[in-house]
């Protein structure tokens, strides 16, 4: 518990919520998830919990799109009270709010074992690429709430009926998208500051699905009713989501390191990277796969596998050091992840207290650099950018809710991997 401060509010998925405000979270590709209630607590933390449905005492309970729990027909709210949610139109078909459907042709790099799952939520269509589990039966069947076919008796598949497990799956190297970004695993060489890597770690995606289905990669594509197209850019056969950056690959020149392209809805916008005129060292060196020269030195040795420019720039974005400290005693783990910033000059420490796999407490402290420097237990694990930190904190908000009501073993370790800046194949960002 923390003292309430007058300017306290909660940030959740880029939205501000007032203390005491309640809402259903928006989770792609499902849209509004009515079976989870979130509340902004007095200390600025978002607390979410699954709705526990009471047992219904009738033969054929009815599912209503905007209500989580099934109801007996005689206890349904009158029609005029009904929340009228916007329907969606896609490819000439109208879908009701909450309806799931399958789409074709959205993802160019779809594998044979993948299908495109879409849902209609509040007038927007959310689509995701889903990797289907291997089928062990001869005659799989289609089910209404999944684009994957399943073997009979494989359990109920809608997320309302599952135990609310977090959707975890191995990394998919093809799909390269934002927070529910598909590859978290840093290159094996990235051993820094004693942070152990988790070879068998499951990647946490923050999307919610049935635990039976924990085997695919969800990639968000939003198809707005007006535009009828995905918020993706296609460059050189690769798909990039809105906000993602890359170096263009031109046939005549190969990868152009000194140009950075960004996907803006569906348009790619490219700009030249400007290198600094002055470097903090006498002899900056040109390194393959990097646009600007780099000062040789200790930092590069400390953090192998990461492509930083001078002054710690990564693909044109300033980087900041990330530290970690972990204490384990009597079945309780306290994990602290700290980001050091220049403006304002402070260290933001994210404190996780986990007992027997259940999150007991999560909070954020902001401490002065001088106070932080005195703390002996923190090890420098990587440097990261503000945009990666934002992705990290959004993911953190999600897992801090999920892990407070169920056992989480590797979710936080997996999430920390988001902070590692990957030098992708051939050195492009």
């Amino acid at each position: 518990e923390q003292v309430k401060h007058s300017e306290t509010y909660c940030m959740f998925q880029d939205k501000k919520y007032r203390v005491g405000e309640r809402w259903h979270p928006y989770l792609e590709p499902y849209g509004l998830v009515y079976c989870v209630n979130c509340i902004c607590s007095e200390n600025g933390n978002v607390l979410c919990s699954r709705v526990r449905c009471p047992n219904v005492h009738c033969l054929s309970p009815v599912h209503i799109p905007h209500l989580c729990c099934p109801r007996c027909p005689d206890s349904l709210p009158p029609v005029n009270n009904k929340v009228t949610s916007k329907s969606c139109e896609y490819n000439g078909t109208t879908y009701q709010h909450g309806e799931l459907f399958v789409a074709e042709g959205l993802f160019q790099n779809r594998q044979p074992n993948q299908c495109t799952q879409c849902s209609c939520s509040e007038g927007n269509v959310y689509c995701g690429l889903k990797t289907c589990p291997k089928l062990t039966c001869a005659f799989p069947v289609s089910v209404p709430d999944s684009c994957c076919r399943v073997c009979r008796g494989d359990g109920e598949l809608s997320w309302e009926h599952s135990d609310g497990d977090i959707f975890r799956q191995p990394a998919n190297r093809e799909a390269r998208h934002s927070y529910h970004r598909s590859h978290y695993d840093p290159p094996p060489s990235r051993q820094a500051g004693g942070l152990s890597r988790f070879p068998g770690a499951r990647s946490h995606r923050g999307a919610l699905m049935d635990s039976q289905q924990a085997s695919g990669t969800i990639v968000q594509i939003v198809i707005n009713n007006k535009h009828k197209h995905g918020q993706v850019c296609v460059s050189n056969g690769k798909t990039y989501s809105h906000g993602e950056s890359w170096h263009p690959n031109l046939r005549a020149f190969g990868i152009v390191e000194c140009v950075l392209c960004t996907c803006n809805v569906t348009k790619q916008e490219c700009k030249k990277i400007h290198c600094p005129n002055r470097y903090p060292c006498k002899y900056p060196q040109k390194i393959d796969g990097k646009c600007c020269k780099v000062c040789p030195g200790k930092k590069a040795k400390e953090l192998p596998g990461q492509s930083f420019d001078n002054k710690g720039y990564f693909c044109g974005e300033e980087t900041m050091p990330v530290y970690e400290s972990v204490f384990m005693e009597d079945g309780e783990t306290t994990r602290k992840i700290a980001l050091e910033t220049e403006r304002p000059p402070q260290v933001e420490v994210h404190v996780w207290t986990i007992r027997k796999g259940i999150l007991q407490h999560f909070h954020i402290e902001k401490i002065s650099k001088r106070m932080f420097e005195e703390l002996p237990h923190f090890k420098l694990v990587t440097r990261t950018t503000l945009s990666q930190w934002k992705i990290f904190t959004e993911g953190e908000a999600q897992i801090s809710q999920m892990c407070s009501s169920r056992v989480c073993r590797t979710e936080l370790e997996d999430l920390v991997k988001v902070l590692y800046l990957e030098r992708s194949e051939k050195g492009h960002c």
Epitope: E1, V3, F327, Q360, E365, I367
Partner: antibody, heavy 119, light 107 residues
Framework: QVQLQQSGAEVAKPGASVKLSCKAS????????MHWVNQRPGQGLEWIGY????????KYNQKFKDKATLTVDKSSSTAYMQLSSLTYEDSAVYYC????????????WGQGTSVTVSS | DIKMTQSPSSMYASLGERVTITCKAS??????LSWFQQKPGKSPKTLIY???RLVDGVPSRFSGSGSGQDYSLTISSLEYEDMGIYYC?????????FGAGTKLELK
């Protein structure tokens, strides 16, 4: 709500030791540093040091390094401060204090324990 | 150690009056400053943290300002229950250090 319940008043002889306790409730004890502050009669506040209950890490004001020893018992969510080799100058009210979001901004205070050193 | 010089050491003020107490640090403390109010026989109570952020439940007549080395606490319109001793605390660096206090009394 957060509460820090401190042990009762102590009267000790010069050269003796006392161990003060501060029982925390209403929050996750291991998640926040516990600070200790003293106040001599009619004087201002003086910071003694803090302990991080999760790791047992302590940081002392150099002035109290040989005087105070900070420890915690996680199982009972209690912080302790042992004062050794007491002198008359150690007569004071001792407070434990913790914070919410900002280290040093001691938002929650115990009610204080009065220590009187008298022969 | 960072020295916090608080002034005045004591002052008399009338109800409804605007009161300002200042604290000067011996070096830049990056706004890591808190203000406390203490009444006789009671524990200190936090009013302000990070130089200008009001703790919830503290009346809005209290405000904090300043940066670098110079900070101040202002009570816009003094009320009877505001009487007591006010302390500033820097927590930019250990050892944490308090100002000597300002005793506020009714004129």
């Amino acid at each position: 709500q957060v509460q820090l319940q401190q042990s009762g008043a102590e009267v000790a002889k010069p050269g003796a030791s006392v161990k003060l306790s501060c029982k925390a409730s209403g929050y996750t004890f291991t998640s926040y540093w516990m600070h200790w502050v003293n106040q001599r009669p009619g004087q201002g506040l003086e910071w003694i040091g803090y302990i991080d209950p999760s790791s047992g890490y302590t940081k002392y004001n150099q002035k109290f390094k040989d005087k105070a020893t900070l420890t915690v018992d996680k199982s009972s969510s209690t912080a302790y401060m042992q004062l050794s080799s007491l002198t008359y100058e150690d007569s004071a009210v001792y407070y434990c204090a913790t914070y919410s979001n900002y280290v040093g901004a001691m938002d929650y205070w115990g009610q204080g324990t009065s220590v009187t050193v008298s022969s | 150690d960072i020295k916090m010089t608080q002034s005045p050491s004591s002052m008399y003020a009338s109800l409804g009056e605007r009161v300002t107490i200042t604290c000067k640090a011996s070096q830049d403390i990056n706004s890591y400053l808190s203000w406390f109010q203490q009444k006789p026989g009671k524990s200190p109570k936090t009013l302000i943290y990070r130089a200008n952020r009001l703790v919830d439940g503290v009346p809005s007549r209290f405000s904090g300002s300043g940066s670098g080395q110079d900070y101040s606490l202002t009570i816009s319109s003094l009320e009877y229950e505001d009487m007591g001793i006010y302390y500033c605390l820097q927590y930019d660096e250990s050892p944490l250090t308090f100002g000597a206090g300002t005793k506020l009394e009714l004129k």
